[in-house]
């Protein structure tokens, strides 16, 4: 058993049918010695008397808010949560496996640049009685500071019969140098509590591996005289790290017909312009990627050919 | 990704082309190592990230773009002193810091070159003959060093008398390639920046 926060305790259980569970001793936080009784949650049934209460915690029915009283007055509370270990592996019931970029990905994180600011998000089908708390650091043995905000509900989607809820959090490394070569990964730890179930999820990454630039901005077309060709031009996104000559991007320009089946013409360039043939009803899209370290491509910025 | 390769203009900063080749070569070598050594811990998540140049050179600090010198987090250790002649320097534009930067890059390349050559000698003794260093990568390191053209004592190749542990050598190769790729990215950024200025 360990303390998650004041008066909230997590009991770790080897979870299998008929498991013996864990013996837990609760102590009433009071100078009083006599006449103390214990109850669980809203029940008035007295579970025991005395300054300490010994319980065998086996299932969720044994978890909850234990309260000690004296003469009708509440002296203190202890909330017991359960953390299930199923065959040596901590349970992951609360969050959905996003399966991207690989199986068992519960937390996904992205950064728009090298400033040390990043966003993580996760999915769940649970709508109520759910709380998250997020901590982060650079490295784990001698951790350096990363400050995270509160996790907020950022999107709701309908997936088949189920509703899916996306939560996200923003974090900022306290003293980040955009040019630094990372040797210690960022660690992100999310505590999730649903009713009386506790779970924790972690992700470890280098900022360089989670970079996803914003799409190029000011995408414009300039028709070339007496030609079906157009000059496409764009700019680096505002959120990208500066100077751009150091933090350079490379670009992919795509001409896409109205039908998804039509052949896509693609050009790669390090410049912020390109000459392409504009077909009728087609659209021109441009996306960006770090020129030197191949992390994710940005989303497409698009303009119609007409 | 399959990008068209840009050929540098004759007037272009001479080292940019070499640094681009270096990044391409080390990235290819790392990819090859990951595939060949699939049963070894060779992915970024599995290896310890060690920097053999740590406390010996300070390329990131010495080569910091001017715009980032205002960022205190980037200025933790800028006490470097290196030799200051080199043919990549377009002489009149050369600042003292630029010379320090390029000589620091040269020292990095020299240290990695020695490590890679020592390691290759060990890998050639492996009865499995599983993986060797790409000669192209070694050549590209050499070309960039020549382009930088700094006078510096030659570092003798390390020779080891004891029987090599091939498992450890292959893991060390992965660690080295990951670190060298990161340094090659920095070198490419620096050359691109210097070329633009």
């Amino acid at each position: 058993i360990w303390e998650l926060k004041k008066d909230v305790y997590v009991v770790e259980l080897d979870w299998y049918p008929d498991a013996p569970g864990e013996m837990v001793v609760l102590t009433c936080d009071t100078p009083e010695e006599d006449g103390i009784t214990w109850t669980l949650d809203q029940s008035s049934e007295v579970l025991g008397s005395g300054k300490t209460l010994t319980i065998q915690v086996k299932e969720f029915g044994d978890a909850g808010q234990y309260t000690c009283h004296k003469g009708g007055e509440v002296l203190s509370h202890s909330l017991l949560l359960l953390h299930k270990k199923e065959d040596g592996i901590w349970s992951t019931d609360i969050l959905k496996d996003q399966k991207e970029p690989k199986n068992k990905t519960f937390l996904r994180c992205e950064a728009k640049n090298y400033s040390g600011r990043f966003t993580c998000w996760w999915l769940t089908t649970i709508s109520t009685d759910l709380t998250f708390s997020v901590k982060s650091s650079r490295g784990s043995s001698d951790p350096q500071g990363v400050t995270c905000g509160a996790a907020t509900l950022s999107a709701e989607r309908v997936r088949g019969d189920n509703k899916e809820y996306e939560y996200s959090v923003e974090c900022q490394e306290d003293s980040a140098c955009p040019a630094a070569e990372e040797s210690l990964p960022i660690e992100v730890m999310v505590d999730a509590v649903h009713k009386l179930k506790y779970e924790n999820y972690t992700s470890s990454f280098f900022i360089r591996d989670i970079i996803k630039p914003d799409p190029p901005k000011n995408l414009q077309l300039k028709p070339l005289k007496n030609s079906r060709q157009v000059e496409v031009s764009w700019e680096y996104p505002d959120t990208w790290s500066t100077p751009h000559s150091y933090f350079s991007l490379t670009f992919c320009v795509q001409v896409q017909g109205k039908s998804k089946r039509e052949k896509k013409d693609r050009v790669f360039t390090d410049k912020t312009s390109a000459t392409v043939i504009c077909r009728k009803n087609a659209s021109i899209s441009v996306r960006a990627q770090d020129r030197y370290y191949s992390s994710s491509w940005s989303e497409w910025a698009s303009v119609p050919c007409s | 990704r399959n990008l068209p390769v840009a050929t540098p203009d004759p007037g272009m900063f001479p080292c940019l082309h070499h640094s681009q080749n270096l990044l391409r070569a080390v990235s290819n070598m790392l990819q090859k190592a990951r595939q060949t050594l699939e049963f070894y811990p060779c992915t970024s998540e599995e290896i310890d990230h060690e920097d053999i140049t740590k406390d010996k050179t300070s390329t990131v600090e010495a080569c910091l773009p001017l715009e980032l010198t205002k960022n205190e987090s980037c200025l933790n250790s800028r006490e470097t002193s290196f030799i200051t002649n080199g043919s990549c320097l377009a002489s009149r534009k050369t600042s003292f810091m630029m010379a320090l930067c390029l000589s620091s890059i040269y020292e990095d390349l020299k240290m990695y070159q020695v490590e890679f050559k020592t390691m290759n000698a060990k890998l050639l003794m492996d009865p499995k003959r599983q993986i060797f260093l790409d000669q192209n990568m070694l050549a590209v390191i050499d070309e960039l060093m020549q382009a930088l053209n700094f006078n510096s004592e030659t570092v003798p190749q390390k020779s080891s008398l004891e029987e090599p542990d091939f498992y450890k050598t292959k893991i060390k190769l992965c660690i080295l390639l990951h670190a060298f790729r990161i340094r090659a990215v920095t070198i490419d950024r620096v050359m691109s920046y210097l070329n633009a200025s």
Epitope: D14, W15, Y16, P17, D18, A19, E59, F60, K85, E86, D87, G88, I89, D93, K102, N103, K104, T125 | F39, P41, E46
Partner: antibody, heavy 115, light 112 residues
Framework: QVQLVQSGGGVVQPGRSLRLSCAAS????????MHWVRQAPGKGLEWVAF????????YYADSVKGRFTISRDNSKNTLYLQMKSLRAEDTAVYYC????????WGQGTMVTVSS | SYVLTQPPSVSGTPGQRVTISCSGG????????VKWYQQLPGTAPKLLIY???QRPSGVPDRFSGSKSGTSASLAITGVQAEDEADYYC????????????FGTGTKVTVLG
Amino acid sequence: QVQLVQSGGGVVQPGRSLRLSCAASGFTFSSYGMHWVRQAPGKGLEWVAFIRYDGSNKYYADSVKGRFTISRDNSKNTLYLQMKSLRAEDTAVYYCKTHGSHDNWGQGTMVTVSS
Amino acid sequence: SYVLTQPPSVSGTPGQRVTISCSGGRSNIGSNTVKWYQQLPGTAPKLLIYFNDQRPSGVPDRFSGSKSGTSASLAITGVQAEDEADYYCQSYDRGTHPALLFGTGTKVTVLG
């Protein structure tokens, strides 16, 4: 004590369907994940499928994906394996089993796919 | 489809020490715990070892398990006639959990 009693096995022709059941008693069935495991005659153990305690997630072996469906009725304390488009290579003893460090197995039920 | 490899058979005379190996990789045994099962003819498998080296109550102490790196082993010290059975190791793969990975199985024969 924990008990898992299986039923539903038998002889079936290729391409036909069969549903296996596993009735649980002696524990809070709705709190635990459950597996199906099979063993072809003279062969080793092969995992078939898993279902979470609340039925929210299901996982299948590639060899049965799209043909077999694992399900549970927590109000009846019963686990099911619906098998469709059966093939000769599905011939095996099928076991249900609880998920956890200490597990409990059903007695097994024989499924024979033969024309 | 088996990624945990066991020897097909091992044998010993009563009282001898018999060991069965189970060889896997970094993503399974290297990152997860190992179980061992005993299966007597015509019966369901019985758990012998969990968490690599723990014995459930009721399992004789002549059975012991160990794990090192990407391999595990089961030892029977002082093998007895009633130990003649098939033995399977089981683990998980970190990418496909909760799918159970079973070893290929080992037939233990007690001679004489």
